[in-house]
Amino acid sequence: EEELQIIQPDKSVSVAAGESAILHCTITSLFPVGPIQWFRGAGPARVLIYNQRQGPFPRVTTVSETTKRENMDFSISISNITPADAGTYYCIKFRKGSPDTEFKSGAGTELSVRAKPS
């Protein structure tokens, strides 16, 4: 089996308040099966931003069509960015189970929010 890698190509992204932020994430293998989740921050205080298994997440849309059976692109777009959205975002693969368990994480993308242009 090819070892699954999670690629977050952007170390940082800067977005003006009120605009949308696109956070890129691709995986290199469909296995092991299990959902992709996005979090802001790390550790126990991290905040769930998107979970492939459940929804909806009103401000979050996937950039590609994740219902394709061979889809490996789990990039997301977050709309109407505010300063509260600043932080490091991690794309994480979970392995199926009861409960699902964290399998591998991307390196993270730091989102910074610029003041809305006047």
């Epitope: 296995f31 099966v33 959902p35 492939q52 394709k68 199926k96």
Partner: antibody, heavy 118, light 107 residues
Framework: DVQLVESGGGVVRPGESLRLSCAAS????????MSWVRQAPGKGLEWLAG????????YYIDSVKGRFTISRDNPKNSLYLQMSSLTAEDTAVYYC???????????WGLGTLVTVSS | ALTQPASVSANPGETVKITCSGG??????YAWYQQKSPGSAPVTVI????KRPSDIPSRFSGSASGSAATLIITGVRVEDEAVYYC???????????FGAGTTLTVL
Amino acid sequence: DVQLVESGGGVVRPGESLRLSCAASGFTFSSYAMSWVRQAPGKGLEWLAGISAGGSDTYYIDSVKGRFTISRDNPKNSLYLQMSSLTAEDTAVYYCARETWNHLFDYWGLGTLVTVSS
Amino acid sequence: ALTQPASVSANPGETVKITCSGGDYYSTYYAWYQQKSPGSAPVTVIHSDDKRPSDIPSRFSGSASGSAATLIITGVRVEDEAVYYCGGYDGRTYINTFGAGTTLTVL
């Protein structure tokens, strides 16, 4: 409530064609992958074909590839199965089903009966 | 191919377990579909190995480990009489498969 209603079944002769429809309501149709499953008399369930939410990607079981075509019209909330070169072995109840995030099925239609007989 | 027993019987109130084997835990998710009569609409009682739809009674549960999945009905009722199909999605082939079905008889 999620509702799936199939139509278009009937009696056809071997070699003829038929187009089945599935009208969806009670959910955002354009967000879900869909599938067709059939059940021959006295037999079990057999998955035939699936289609991604946007309709760009389709998947088939080998035995119907080239004869059956799955498609969808998202503005009309409708799923279709075009069947050609029908044989007696295609006699079955045909169900449309909504897919879960991981391509299992959570809701099923009531089915439409297709009988292929000379 | 997914393999499940042809039939299972139980008395009301007993716990029923129906097993399904043949998938690969690494690449397969399982579901269980209930069909009360031939040609009637199937009802999903479990999907994603162990997830129960909100309208399904809590006596239905599921699990998966290794190459097998199990449907458990705790405190089976007469109205649970049906054929139960194990279904799987294999991420290697992009194909859905079904077992041949297990007829549950409640005595």
